[in-house]
């Protein structure tokens, strides 16, 4: 799924977070001039992925891939083969459905977030994983952390690398 | 994950049990000359999977896949691509970690069984499901049933089909 065609730096950060790759995360955050509090916030999210094991990262990668390749994000109907799956969004801007998902992941209730993921016909096990990650993030992150994460996302969305 | 390369008849029985497929279970058990009490024991385990619904079967399949493809069961470090993930165990013998898990499922306490599954970085939701199944098996099976299940497992492990 060539999601990077829309906003490469966003997907760099997401996959660095989701895969628990701290070095890659640091490199990606340096590119968008992340502050120290913004880095701390992202590392707290990364901790949740790491603590919930490999399967958690696989499943949440599936959530991002599913939303990014959904009709909400695609300019035209996609072909069924994964190889042919391309994002034909307008320009390189991040898809609103992805933005909404990330927003709810940080500021919504567990129910609101999971319900949004559920719209994309995700498997029950994917939804349960999404809820676990959301609960973890709510437990780990203060309101200040969440504000820092949102301000970092704004930097990402408005970055020339997006 | 080509688990069937290690002990095909074991995985045949496991997936027949977990998927609630009574016909497939009967066929697999006939191959290892299971006695009537051994069949009864396996059907009690199968009932637990059936009663707990599809998600239970998916999640427990995930447990088996996770353990079977873990470092404890792999002869060498796996490559990162899912396509290249193969089980390079010694010969066709069942992996000791899988044996231990099945053993604890029958003879251990719920805590012991879930703690063993937890070593494989399973999601909390997977662990909860594992406990539900374990509790169900403990409630449904007599000591005699468990002994019969263990004797059947011995037949499976020593079968030429393993």
């Amino acid at each position: 799924v060539k999601m990077a065609e829309t906003c490469p730096i966003f997907y760099d950060v997401f996959f660095a977070v989701a895969n628990g790759n701290e070095l890659l995360l640091d490199l990606s955050l340096t590119k968008v001039n992340a502050t120290e509090p913004e880095r701390t916030a992202m590392k707290k999210i990364q901790d949740c992925y790491v603590e919930n094991g490999l399967i958690s990262r696989v499943l949440d990668g599936l959530v991002m891939t599913t939303i990014s390749s959904s009709k909400d994000c695609m300019g035209e109907a996609v072909q069924n083969t994964v190889e042919d799956l391309k994002l034909n969004t307008l320009g390189r801007e991040i898809c609103p459905a992805v933005k909404r998902g990330v927003d709810l992941f940080l500021t919504g209730t567990p129910d609101e977030y999971v319900e949004q993921v559920a719209q994309y016909k995700a498997l029950p096990v994917v939804l349960e994983n999404a809820r676990i990650l959301k609960n973890c993030v709510d437990a780990k992150m203060t309101e200040e952390d969440k504000e820092n994460a949102l301000s970092l996302l704004d930097k990402i969305y408005t970055s020339p690398l997006c | 994950v080509k688990m069937a390369e290690t002990c095909p008849i074991f995985y045949d029985v496991f997936f027949a049990v977990a998927n609630g497929n009574e016909l497939l279970l009967d066929l697999s058990l006939t191959k290892v000359n299971a006695t009537e009490p051994e069949r009864t024991a396996m059907k009690k385990i199968q009932d637990c999977y059936v009663e707990n619904g599809l998600i239970s079967r998916v999640l427990d399949g995930l447990v088996m896949t996770t353990i079977s493809s873990s470092k404890d069961c792999m002869g060498e470090a796996v490559q990162n691509t899912v396509e290249d993930l193969k089980l390079n165990t010694l010969g066709r013998e069942i992996c000791p970690a899988v044996k231990r898990g099945v053993d604890l499922f029958l003879t251990g306490t719920p805590d012991e069984y879930v703690e063993q599954v937890a070593q494989y970085k399973a999601l909390p939701v997977v662990l909860e499901n594992a406990r539900i199944l374990k509790n169900c098996v403990d409630a449904k099976m007599t000591e005699e049933d468990k002994e019969n299940a263990l004797s059947l497992l011995d037949k499976i492990y020593t079968s030429p089909l393993c």
Epitope: E51, P110, V114, K140 | A118, P124, E128, N129
Partner: antibody
Framework: QVVLVESGGGVVQPGRSLRLSCAAS????????MHWVRQAPGKGLEWVAV????????YYADSVKGRFTISRDNSNNTIYLQMNSLRAEDTAVYYC????????????????WGQGTLVTVSS | DIQMTQSPSTLSASVGDRVTITCRAS??????LAWYQQKPGKAPKLLIF???GLESGVPFRFSGSGSGTEFTLTISSLQPDDFATYYC?????????FGQGTKVEIK
């Protein structure tokens, strides 16, 4: 088998502090999240706080946030609840409870409970 | 916080009766619901988790069902040992909340 024994309860004046302990045995303590749950006399149950298996995350009910601190000592199989600025409404039996499922991120399902220790806040 | 409301508050029944206790959540908690039994002067005991999963050692006469906002605990044939107070608890978030309890007493 799993045994949880609370101690440290007693009568204390409003505004004062108290520290509760819970000694655990019969399970791999360092693998489980631990909780405090309380019950006011004749009332229902109220969750108070959780500490994750490795002590990395602590989470509190709004009613005690900023006043109570949960901690654990994995080498001694013990959890603690430091209660400061106590109020009359904190009067309750305090139970220590073990999470049902091991490791991080587990749901707050209370699989095993201690017998409780009574805290009375009164002048 | 999510509010949990149980009904009835008190229930009078006889040995052998089928008993049903209802628990309602102020918002959806999916299937993340547990039930506990508490006897006077004792700690609560976990009966059911994830709506219908029976905890170890709990008799099959106890069963749970429901999803979203409405849940039930059923005791198929009430036994003398079952007279107690029952609590539901949601764990959809890291701020778990309990129902106010249902006391099952002898008729």
């Amino acid at each position: 088998q799993v045994v949880l024994v609370e101690s440290g309860g007693g009568v204390v004046q409003p505004g004062r502090s108290l520290r509760l302990s819970c000694a655990a045995s019969g399970f791999t303590f360092s693998s489980y999240g631990m909780h405090w749950v309380r019950q006011a006399p004749g009332k229902g149950l109220e969750w108070v706080a959780v500490i994750w298996y490795d002590g990395s995350i602590k989470y509190y009910a709004d009613s005690v946030k900023g006043r109570f601190t949960i901690s654990r000592d994995n080498s001694n199989n013990t959890i603690y609840l430091q209660m400061n600025s106590l109020r009359a409404e904190d009067t309750a039996v305090y139970y220590c409870a073990r999470a049902l499922i091991p490791v991080a991120g587990t749901d707050p399902i209370f699989g095993y409970w201690g017998q409780g220790t009574l805290v009375t806040v009164s002048s | 916080d999510i509010q949990m409301t149980q009904s009835p508050s008190t229930l009078s029944a006889s040995v052998g009766d089928r008993v049903t206790i209802t628990c309602r959540a102020s918002q959806s908690v999916s299937s993340w619901l547990a039930w506990y039994q508490q006897k006077p002067g004792k700690a609560p005991k976990l009966l059911i988790f994830k709506t219908s999963g029976l905890e170890s050692g709990v008799p099959f006469r106890f069963s749970g069902s429901g999803s979203g906002t409405e849940f039930t605990l059923t005791i198929s044939s009430l036994q003398p040992d079952d007279f107690a107070t029952y609590y539901c608890q949601q764990y959809n978030t890291y701020s778990p909340t309990f129902g106010q309890g249902t006391k099952v007493e002898i008729k």
